[in-house]
């Protein structure tokens, strides 16, 4: 469930603190409820960038697990189509710390509406 996703995000945050990754990532910091699945997709795609850049097994495994969890939760809600949402590349670029904070925020939005 989404609680496990937050726990994985916290783990990624802790792992990243011990590394020096200067990447900036496309970040949706003001998610409209009607675009939350699209925003989640962007967050997950950017997480893969973190995994690639870190080259770290723990980060890699945690990112994959997080994607598996999110996939299964969202698939159980059926196919959700959203329109008029921003493309990932249109989002603001932010540092990893801000990116992860915004990610936690969107997950909490899913928790509140489930």
């Amino acid at each position: 469930n989404w609680v496990n996703v937050i726990s994985d995000l916290k783990k990624i945050e802790d792992l990243i603190q011990s590394m020096h990754i200067d990447a900036t990532l496309y970040t949706e910091s003001d998610v409209h409820p009607s675009c939350k699945v699209t925003a989640m997709k962007c967050f997950l795609l950017e997480l893969q960038v973190i995994s690639h850049e870190s080259g770290d097994t723990d980060i890699h495994d945690t990112v994959e697990n997080l994607i598996i969890l999110a996939n299964n939760i969202l698939s159980s809600n059926g196919n959700i189509t959203e329109s008029g949402c921003k493309e990932c590349e249109e989002l603001e670029e932010k540092n990893i710390k801000e990116f992860l904070q915004s990610f936690v925020h969107i997950v909490q939005m899913f928790i509140n509406t489930s």
Partner: antibody, heavy 122, light 112 residues
Amino acid sequence: EVRLMASGGGLVQPGGSLRLSCAASEFTFSNYAMSWVRQAPGKGLEWVATISRGGDYTYYPDSVKGRFTISRDNSKNTLYLQMNSLRAEDTAVYYCARRVSMITGGWAMDYWGQGTLVTVSS
Amino acid sequence: DVVMTQSPLSLPVTLGQPASISCRSSQSIVDITGNTYLEWYQQRPGQSPRRLIYKVFNRFSGVPDRFSGSGSGTDFTLKISRVEAEDVGVYYCFQDSFVPYTFGQGTKLEIK
């Protein structure tokens, strides 16, 4: 050439336990997630378990969840499947398979071992 | 759970002729990141399964180019442009977009 050698199969009574092993060589074992897939006699393939590269994350179908445990020892390049509370329907050839990463190449099992036969019967 | 349904279950083909196997999923297997984790595996008689295609249409290295994969959403196809004797065996589609990962029932290809 990548090599995966499954072993540990045999005859076991219903309710019994068995531990399968899969010895990996000719690749960096710790860089790959691994899976077990089984095939009942004359039947199709069924996914049984997957474990992440570091071993922290495991995934199972409901048919084996709570009875089977996948694990790995990266220092020994070995994958395991601990099977408890075995049933007649667990009778199958068990294959271990190397799994390509979602992040680096799209999920897929790119190399398979030769399989080890588990027979559950009284 | 995602159910994968293959057809036909038996496929007799003349050597040198094309062959086509269909695989349908009970729901879309496009994941949240837009990827479709659909693979095809071949199992020759008495052998372990062997990789063929990943992510719908990507051929693994060493797989002959007579094998091709296509499809999207819920409908997928494996095509063999000209069947050779070594292609005899059972072909399985497999989805690993969503846990539990699931195989199709298999399609047995035989020579007429």
